[in-house]
Interface confidence: low
């Protein structure tokens, strides 16, 4: 509430998050030409990645390219990489869309498909759709604890969203538990009218807004956060404009003294915590 006599000051804030939860992941892998179903358990270290600023990331889906090493191999077949003879390939050419540097040779990829040979991390990552349903679909049951310290230096006032005596086993609910700092990821999506399982396939960006409207006058003192949620990525983006949220990272290892890597295309949800508000004092 705006009191004309109050001196207003914007909030200064720091945020720290802790994600908890375990997911059982069922991956289909091909070994010696035979499809196998592999069950593995993913914990926090497997599905979260350190981010800068007031953000945290939860992996919900992935595509793996295993056993890559630096050498020559055919490009993955696409309209741009298919060829019928060496004339269709340009030595030294680096297409921004490509995964390597062309050698100038047109070689067999598979069957009667020929593509330009490249010097790259091989085998080249396949152009594949993200798995459906998402491999870590159960991430909707993960929880995140948000620790938010705020400061109004001009008013010499500091507080935080977690007060002593808070029941740390609580789960946030808009009406029944609006001060609980522990959020179930699936509930955040429900609040914005989005389906977690749908977003988990391609990834997305979700905003967690923490609004502090603080009255710091002694007689009317009130300074508690109000949480709300907002979907930040464009849900309507068509395929050509790269929907969702993904990035690639690699796990490096050595095999027979040859450096190799497993390339992982990670899809997931980036949560941006947006803290704003003011503190007013007479």
């Amino acid at each position: 509430s705006d009191k004309l006599y109050q001196r207003k000051e914007p909030v200064i804030s720091s945020v720290h998050t802790k994600v908890k939860g375990i997911a059982e992941v069922k991956e289909e892998i091909v070994e010696n030409g035979v499809k196998k179903l592999v069950h593995s358990v993913f914990d926090t270290a497997d599905y979260t990645f350190p981010l800068q600023g007031n953000s945290f990331f939860v992996m919900t889906n992935f595509l793996k390219t295993e056993g890559q090493e630096q050498r020559l191999c055919p490009e993955y077949p696409t309209r741009r990489t298919l060829c019928s003879s060496d004339r269709g390939c340009k030595k030294g050419w680096m297409d921004p869309q490509s995964k390597g540097i062309q050698t100038g040779r047109c070689v067999v990829y598979e069957g009667n498909q020929k593509t330009c040979e490249v010097s790259a991390w091989c085998p080249i990552e396949a152009v594949e759709e993200a798995p459906r349903p998402a491999l870590l679909n159960s991430a909707e049951n993960f929880t995140v604890l948000i620790k938010n310290n705020i400061d109004f230096p001009g008013h010499n006032y500091t507080t935080r969203n977690i007060l002593p005596g808070l029941n740390i086993t609580c789960t946030f609910h808009k009406t029944q538990n609006p001060q609980c700092p522990i959020f179930r990821l699936g509930d955040i999506f429900r609040e914005t009218g989005d389906n977690f399982s749908d977003v988990a396939i391609q990834g997305g960006i979700m905003g967690i807004e923490i609004y502090w409207d603080c009255n710091l006058d002694r007689w009317f003192h009130h300074c508690r956060p109000k949480y709300s949620f907002r979907r930040l990525d464009d849900k309507t983006t068509n395929v050509s404009l790269y929907p969702g949220y993904n990035f690639r990272y690699a796990k490096y290892y050595k095999e027979n003294n040859v450096e190799k890597r497993t390339l992982i295309k990670v899809f997931g949800i980036r949560f941006d915590i947006l803290v704003f508000g003011t503190g007013g004092k007479f």
Epitope: G33, V107, G111, C122, P123, E255
Partner: nanobody
Framework: EVQLVESGGKLVQAGGSLRLSCSAS??????????MGWFRQAPGKELEFVAA????????YYADSVKGRFIISRHNPRNSVYLQLNSLKPEDTAVYYC?????????????????????WGQGTQVTVSS
């Protein structure tokens, strides 16, 4: 367990010919979806790529030093790969190894690197005298 067995190596005169054979056996090995290669190692020298044949379209690849003289071929029903050595030179003297790589998905095609191949034979000696 996959086994590759080479045969056909012997002593020949320079300018002569030889045919090396390699047969593959083993329950886990799918011969029709593998890359087969020949490598050689001369005394005191590194392992050297000779030739390879791709499982798809029977595409063949050769080292520059043997191009036009050696011919690699394969016979799927017999699970065999052959290397025909023509116009032999003394510098072709080496132990010749058969190698195989069973690929589970497309993309790996750097035939002249030994690290590509996961199965190897014991080798057969070829000696070319002048």
């Amino acid at each position: 367990e996959v086994q590759l067995v080479e045969s056909g190596g012997k002593l020949v005169q320079a300018g002569g010919s030889l045919r090396l054979s390699c047969s593959a056996s083993g329950r886990t090995f799918s011969f029709s979806t593998s890359t087969m290669g020949w490598f050689r190692q001369a005394p005191g020298k590194e392992l050297e790529f000779v030739a390879a044949i791709d499982w798809s379209d029977f595409n063949t690849y050769y080292a520059d030093s043997v191009k036009g003289r050696f011919i690699i071929s394969r016979h799927n029903p017999r699970n065999s790969v052959y290397l025909q050595l023509n116009s032999l030179k003394p510098e072709d003297t080496a132990v010749y190894y058969c190698a195989a790589h069973s690929e589970t998905r497309g993309g790996t095609r750097y035939f002249d690197r030994p690290s590509l191949y996961n199965y190897w034979g014991q080798g057969t000696q070829v000696t070319v005298s002048s």
